[in-house]
């Protein structure tokens, strides 16, 4: 790892709306250097959202994650609090990006290009969506009729910045919220591990009730194919855009020294997803919100710039 | 249509262990969160614990910890929930439900299962 | 834990009656609630959840308000198949709590 950046690596030009802390795992503010401040998120679901630090909610969503942090280390867990540079513990997997949110993820490996636009059945089995149930875009075989999405807040458009598979790269997310006791989930990881190729529809998932807060994900598990195909009927709501394929290790690749400038572009502009019919009321989007969220998020490409810093070819040699 | 049907009714001893399941159908299983929530005679709601299908993050309510263990089958879409050392405090109507997993929305519970009577008596 | 206090417990009323049922947080819960109604026998039923927006085939009678810590459910016009016992939840932290519940009987 290289330490030492000062420079500002996530960009938020959108805040979110509220989030419940109960579905949150981690926060770290952004760095100094980024102007606007802002709080990054992590869902347990392993997805990043730039929240206002200004706003109660985010006041309050700290506070408690602090007082989770605090217990958990007073039950013997370990808990690093670092204020400052944020670094991804792990590589993004595709999110939902808006447009304005420029990311410089920290990355491990040699470089190597990366097509703008994998597949459909590729980018599945990248972000773990399940092929029925596509993030971001209704399913036939989606039969579930949800309540009726909220009128008054059609949701923050391409708030998420992207989702973090949980073990992945040596990167580590340096947060003020509880850490697993035992071997961490945060600590470095082998860069050459990938996600488990096994059906996930085949395996028996138990989890049992540990000791008392041990709230956070289990330990070394790994999130494929779960908060990645949410409703289909509300997976625009807050997140207009679903995540945009790409390849889950496409920056294992890059030099230790390089940052990567992600930004998302429209392949086409032809087509917008459909929804399923919701029986008291249709999806109102917020009326501040650009119409481009709404595009397909099939048709969105990422172009990812691998951008070496001066040292990072005297570190390769 | 979606549905969550739950096992029959239970008839227990104090120490023992009860398992109730909860199959799903009408959705995707493991694209829903599945909670499991106590009624007890004449008594409100109590929320025991959550599961998630897809990735296995379970979160317990302190009162239930160590007693209760969720698990699912994803080959059936079918949830369980096993509390042990039972008590006869533990005699309760148990209901499993669904909470959207847009998780950016929270956890309220939008389908029901039917409910399974647990009877824990000597 | 966030206690949710629920207020009356129960309550008689007549068929177009206008209800109001409270609900009130020990903590702020940023409109992470909902409200449920539950029969005999039955399964609680999902009415209102987040920013009071109405749960799918749920009449329009039925409408919530409040914000911080007070909440609210208001039945506008009572109908024969309102009586019922309901309950608030808020999902702003866990453990989810549930208010004690109000019964809903006819005078």
């Known amino acids: 790892q290289h330490h030492g950046v000062t420079k500002c690596n996530i960009t938020c030009s959108k805040m979110t709306s509220k989030i419940p802390v109960a579905l949150l795992i981690h926060y770290q503010q952004n760095q100094a250097s980024c102007g606007k401040r802002a709080i990054i998120l992590e869902t347990r679901q392993h997805r990043l959202f730039c929240a206002d630090p200004k706003e109660q909610w985010v006041k309050d969503a700290m506070q408690h994650l602090d007082r989770q942090a605090a217990a958990l280390t007073r039950n013997g867990g370990t808990f690093e609090k670092q204020i400052g540079e944020v670094k991804p513990r792990t590589t993004p997997a595709a999110g939902g990006m808006d447009e304005s949110v420029v990311l410089e993820p920290e990355a491990t490996g040699e470089s190597s290009s990366l097509e703008p636009t994998p597949s459909s059945q590729e980018a599945q089995r990248a972000l773990g969506t399940s092929p029925e149930l596509p993030t971001g875009v209704t399913g036939s075989s989606g039969t579930r009729l949800p309540p009726t999405p909220k009128a008054q807040d059609g949701g923050p458009v391409g708030t998420e910045l992207f989702r973090v598979p949980p073990v992945s790269t040596a990167a580590t997310w340096q947060s003020s919220a509880p850490h697993q006791p035992g071997p961490s989930l945060w600590a470095e990881a082998k860069t050459s591990e990938a996600p488990s190729t096994q059906d996930p529809s085949t395996q028996a998932s138990t989890a049992s009730s540990p000791a008392p807060e041990e709230n956070a994900p289990s330990e070394g598990q790994r999130v494929w194919g779960q908060g990645q195909s949410p409703r289909p009927e509300n997976s625009l709501e807050r997140e207009e855009m679903g995540p945009v394929p790409a390849h889950t290790d496409a920056f294992q690749d890059w030099g230790p020294g390089s940052m990567a400038h992600v930004s998302v572009v429209p392949v086409s502009s032809e087509g917008t997803p459909s929804r399923e019919p919701v029986a008291s009321g249709s999806w109102t989007p917020k009326a501040e919100e650009p119409i481009h969220a709404t595009m397909d998020p099939q048709r969105l490409g990422v172009l990812i710039t691998p951008v070496p810093d001066a040292q990072a070819a005297t570190r390769r040699q | 249509e979606v549905q969550l049907v739950q096992s029959g009714a239970e008839v227990k001893k104090p120490g023992a262990t009860v398992k109730i399941s909860c199959k799903a159908s009408g959705y995707t299983f493991t694209n829903y969160n599945i909670h499991w929530v106590q009624q007890a005679p004449g008594k409100g709601l109590e929320w025991m614990g959550w599961y998630l299908p897809g990735d296995d993050s379970p979160r317990f309510n302190e009162r239930f910890k160590g007693r209760v263990t969720i698990t699912a089958d994803k080959s059936t879409n079918t949830a369980y929930m096993e509390l042990s050392s039972l008590r006869s405090e533990d005699t309760a109507v148990y209901y499993c439900?669904?909470?959207?997993?847009?998780?950016?929305?929270?956890?309220?519970?939008?389908?029901w299962g039917q409910g399974t009577t647990l009877t824990v008596s000597s | 834990d966030i206690q949710m206090t629920q207020s009356p417990s129960s309550l008689s009323a007549s068929v177009g009656d206008r209800v109001t049922i409270t609900c009130r947080a020990s903590g702020r819960i940023h409109d992470f609630l909902a409200w449920y109604q539950q029969k005999p026998g039955k399964a609680p039923k999902l009415l209102l959840y987040t920013d009071n927006a109405l749960a799918e085939g749920v009449p329009s009678r039925f409408s919530g308000s409040g914000t911080g810590t007070d909440y609210t459910l208001t039945i506008s016009s009572l109908q024969p198949e309102d009586f019922a016992t309901y309950y608030c939840q808020q999902f702003w932290s866990t453990p989810y709590t549930f208010g004690g519940g109000t019964k809903l009987e006819i005078k």
């Open positions: 439900a669904t909470s959207p997993t847009d998780e950016t929305q929270g956890d309220y519970f939008d389908y």
